[in-house]
């Protein structure tokens, strides 16, 4: 059974990785730039099913593409720095799904824009950090 | 104990620029994110961003952007917001809060001319 | 953004009292609600988090309750040193936003 040390780590990182996303969201909906109408063609995939830690797994297979995408971000009004940003958003993903998961992720049938793709894990996070608190 | 400690009150006129800090004690400085929070006088309270004390990257409110930048100096676990432009609009109380259980105790920005 | 509504924006009340503020917002934001108790000259001092939770240190006179768009603050005898201004706050999205505020003043 999880300690309460263990599930205030749990919480904790999740809260970091809820910031971070949330962070994203913010950053693209203030973007006032022709760059993101490009940056809603490009196209996520969405987990089938994302209510546990092991379901991570489907965010950190997109962590790549969502890179890329912020890379066309890049401005002085954009202020994530998304290599650091992404790193940050692994290391936490790897903590909490755990590394010796061997969970192949199921993906839904339809894919997302990267604002439908943020908000699906935001809400994935303040899910289970409800569950904790 | 859990304190952050800000830099002293300023006065500045329209068009400068202010440089307010936050020093944090008694915790892990890159545990929690550190938000800043402004308050005009009789008014109430307006986020106006938020920046990672281990990578230090930011995110603002619309409304600043462009204006504010926040930084941090891991060796001094001190985090730094500065404003640029200034007006008399923006004449505050400006605070940090991380984890928004633990503020500073706030510093004072008075812009006039 | 999501904007958060406070009522009523003052009370005047004694010592003893219930005192119950709401604070509703514009779009569902779950538990995702704080509430802060603010002193002239003083930072905010976080009361509730999490819609209901009770921060640590904070006396068991103030509660917490709501989710979706409607919330309220309840303080079931109001004490000398409760009179302050108190402010709601929404975590759910970025921005973070704050309800305007209620004074709670000595009738």
């Known amino acids: 059974a999880p300690t309460s040390s263990s599930t205030k780590k749990t919480q904790l990182q999740l809260e970091h990785l809820l910031l971070d996303l949330q962070m994203i969201l913010n950053g693209i909906n203030n973007y006032k730039n022709p760059k993101l109408t490009r940056m809603l063609t490009f196209k996520f995939y969405m987990p089938k099913k994302a209510t546990e830690l092991k379901h991570l797994q489907c965010l950190e297979e997109e962590l790549k593409p969502l890179e890329e995408v912020l890379n066309l971000a890049q401005s002085k009004n954009f202020h994530l720095r998304p290599r650091d940003l992404i790193s940050n958003i692994n290391v936490i993903v790897l903590e909490l799904k755990g590394s010796e998961t061997t969970f192949m992720c199921e993906y839904a049938d339809e894919t997302a824009t990267i604002v439908e793709f943020l908000n699906r894990w935001i809400t994935f996070c303040q899910s289970i950090i409800s569950t904790l608190t | 104990q859990v304190q952050l400690v800000q830099s002293g009150a300023e006065v500045k006129k329209p068009g400068a620029s202010v440089k307010v800090s936050c020093k944090a004690s008694?915790?892990?400085?890159?545990?929690?994110?550190m938000h800043w929070v402004r308050q005009a006088p009789g008014q109430g309270l307006e986020w106006m961003g938020i920046?990672?004390?281990?990578?230090?990257?930011?995110s603002y409110a619309l409304k600043f952007q462009g204006r504010v930048t926040m930084t941090r100096d891991t060796s001094t676990s001190t985090v730094y917001m500065e404003l640029s432009s200034l007006r008399s609009e923006d004449t505050a109380v400006y605070y940090c809060?991380?984890?928004?259980?633990?503020w500073g105790q706030g510093t004072l920005v008075t812009v006039s001319s | 953004d999501i904007q958060m509504t406070q009522s009523p924006s003052s009370l005047s009340a004694s010592v003893g009292d219930r005192v119950t503020i709401t604070c509703r917002a514009s779009?569902?934001?779950?538990?995702?609600l704080a509430w802060y108790q603010q002193k002239p000259g003083k930072a905010p001092k976080l009361l509730i988090y999490?819609?209901?939770s009770l921060d640590s240190g904070v006396p068991s006179r103030f509660s917490g309750s709501g989710s979706g768009t409607d919330f309220t603050l309840t303080i079931s005898s109001l004490q000398p040193e409760d009179f302050a201004t108190y402010y709601c706050q929404q975590s759910y999205s970025f921005p973070v936003t704050f309800g305007q505020g209620t004074k709670v003043e000595i009738k």
């Open positions: 008694g915790y892990t400085f890159t545990r929690y994110y």
């Open positions: 809060t991380s984890g928004w259980d633990v």
């Open positions: 999490a819609a209901s």
């Open positions: 779009q569902s934001i779950s538990t995702w």
């Open positions: 920046i990672n004390p281990r990578a230090g990257y930011t």
